[in-house]
Amino acid sequence: IPLSRTVRCTCISISNQPVNPRSLEKLEIIPPSQFCPHVEIIATMKKKGEKRCLNPESKAIKNLLKAVSKERSKRSP
């Protein structure tokens, strides 16, 4: 789950579960910083605006990132 705060990492738990790119409203990738030493990936779902913290090390999530970036590159001129 994500918690909003000004310091430390945002994600309290992370999920390995694959997410359907079509059901994604937004995908935030937060790089490591002075507050949090690792990458954080927060998916906002279209349904109810539900959010999930995703495990950047998970194969399913790596595949999701590839699919999303491929989709983006298709859209950009």
Epitope: I1, C9, S13, S15, K48
Partner: antibody, heavy 121, light 109 residues
């Protein structure tokens, strides 16, 4: 199956210390935030502390801040609660619980059976 | 800190009847952050409802949750003998503490 087993409870004098443990199995412990929740005899549930999956984030109830420390060892699939300067009002059943990782906040979906701490002189 | 109030304190009903339990927050709670738990004597709590209205895995459909803002409701459409227990609501705001309500005891009339 998914399981949490607490241990380390007992009878302790006021001002002394105790360390509770919670052994996790059947799920990816290193992905899950973990909570301690307590219940005084005949009373309701009181949230005590939370630690993030990676041990970076720690949060405490005001009633235990500065006295209790939550920690975890992901290599051992174990959660801990170090309780110092214990008071009579800390007497309770202490539960560890898993923070459901599949959503924004889906509650505490797995609970241990609890371990009893009695603070008495 | 958000304070949760549950009413009634005790609800005396017969099996087959409908139970309506209320949880009121001292300030607005995102519905994503409201959960309900059931606890029977000598047992650990069990998650029933999350996100104010979604049933947790394995929870029968006679349990339903509703509400938003400061007012939330847990409804048990037809009480089964195993439903007599204490029910707690819990909020999980954008930062701790993650408070529980004081509980509602549903007992047999």
């Amino acid at each position: 199956q998914v399981q949490l087993v607490e241990s380390g409870g007992g009878v302790v004098q006021p001002g002394r210390s105790l360390r509770l443990s919670c052994a996790a199995s059947g799920f990816t412990f290193s992905n899950s935030g973990m909570h301690w929740v307590r219940q005084a005899p005949g009373k309701g549930l009181e949230w005590v502390a939370l630690i993030g999956f990676d041990g970076i984030n720690e949060y405490y109830a005001d009633s235990v801040k500065g006295r209790f420390t939550i920690s975890r060892d992901n290599s051992k699939n174990t959660l801990y609660l170090q309780m110092n300067s214990l008071r009579a009002e800390d007497t309770a059943v202490y539960y560890c619980a898993r923070d459901w990782p599949e959503g924004y906040y889906n509650g505490m979906d797995v609970w241990g059976q609890g371990t009893t701490v009695t603070v008495s002189s | 800190e958000i304070v949760l109030t549950q009413s009634p304190g005790t609800l005396s009903l017969s099996p087959g009847e409908r139970a309506t339990l209320s949880c009121r927050a001292s300030q607005s709670v995102s519905s994503s952050y409201l959960a309900w738990y059931q606890q029977k004597p000598g047992q650990a709590p069990r998650l029933l409802i999350y996100g104010a209205s979604s049933r947790a895995t394995g929870i029968p459909d006679r349990f339903s949750g509703s509400g938003s803002g400061t007012d939330f409701t847990l409804t048990i459409s037809r009480l089964e003998p195993e439903d007599f227990a204490v029910y707690y609501c819990q909020q999980y705001g954008s930062s701790p503490p993650f408070t529980f309500g004081p509980g509602t005891k549903v007992d047999i009339k």
